[in-house]
């Protein structure tokens, strides 16, 4: 009789352990679901807010026609400037026309005054040709005014109304450019 009771007690204890395990699994599953829901909601929220917030340019960027520009508040060497722009889904500024150059220099005058700003222009070490980052050549009126006396790689920068050249390893502010979003209205 005693043996029978202890067997039943053991079975009950085993059942209890199984139920506790199941409850633990369920709690874990519920927590995981809640986390996933939170994650989904946050993702949806971000997507919705960026959809509602569909101004042509991100905050702190300046718009001119089809482009958005970001004027950095930090100094960096040319290569790091390039990477900083890529993080934002943009590239270093590529000046296509005199109108764009005038807009940039006018904006810089208003924002910061006469500082140096890296743009996406560099000089090929072998040929000495100036090229934009996508491999295209600048128009004749948009070539750096002075040839840098540097044995190192030479890159282009904007200062006041001019496009100039300097050793790419010097520290300057930089300007990023991306396309403005088209309004869907």
């Amino acid at each position: 009789k005693l043996l029978q009771v202890s067997t039943i007690a053991m079975q009950q204890q085993e059942k209890l352990i199984q139920q506790e395990r199941a409850l633990l699994n369920f709690t874990e599953w519920k927590r995981s679901c809640a986390l996933q829901m939170k994650y989904c909601q946050a993702f949806m929220q971000n997507s919705l807010s960026s959809a509602h917030n569909s101004s042509p340019c991100p905050n702190n960027w300046i718009q001119n026609r089809e482009s958005c520009y970001y004027v950095s508040e930090i100094w960096s060497i040319w290569h790091t400037s390039q990477e900083n722009c890529l993080k934002e889904g943009s590239t270093l500024l590529q000046i296509e026309s005199k109108e764009e150059m005038d807009f940039i220099t006018g904006s810089l005058r208003k924002i910061k005054g006469s500082y140096d700003y890296w743009v996406g222009l560099s000089q090929d070490g072998h040929s000495g040709r100036w090229l934009w980052q996508d491999g295209s050549s600048p128009s004749p009126g948009l070539l750096p005014a002075e040839r840098s006396q540097s044995a190192n790689q030479v890159c282009g920068y904007v200062k006041s109304n001019s496009l100039l050249s300097s050793n790419c390893s010097t520290w300057k502010y930089f300007i990023c450019e991306k396309y403005a979003l088209r309004s869907s209205v």
Epitope: F43, L86, G89, T91
Partner: nanobody, 115 residues
Framework: QVQLQESGGGLAQPGGSLQLSCAAS????????MGWYRQASGKQRELVAA???????TLADSVKGRFTISSDNTKNTVFLQMNSLKPEDTAVYYC?????????GGQGTQVTVSS
Amino acid sequence: QVQLQESGGGLAQPGGSLQLSCAASGRAFSTNSMGWYRQASGKQRELVAAITSQGRITLADSVKGRFTISSDNTKNTVFLQMNSLKPEDTAVYYCNAWTTLGTFGGQGTQVTVSS
């Protein structure tokens, strides 16, 4: 966390071609830019090419006119088409993704240009 899967490295003759591809995967992220760095033994890592989600392109001076970069935004995949290869292009090529979750790098794929 974003995982990057590179493929297409190998051995090529000088003047030959290779295409590298890299696919980014992971939980809910969006890619701002994707690109390729390379590192030859004993040299510094350099950015070879990158493309933004809008299709804006950045190329190193040493590869302009020879390499092209393209992407398939729907699949978070980037391709590096390398033509007119030179021995000095020999390096380990690393895929890189600048995403809303941060910046991620791949394991690298070896490219050797030799006759």
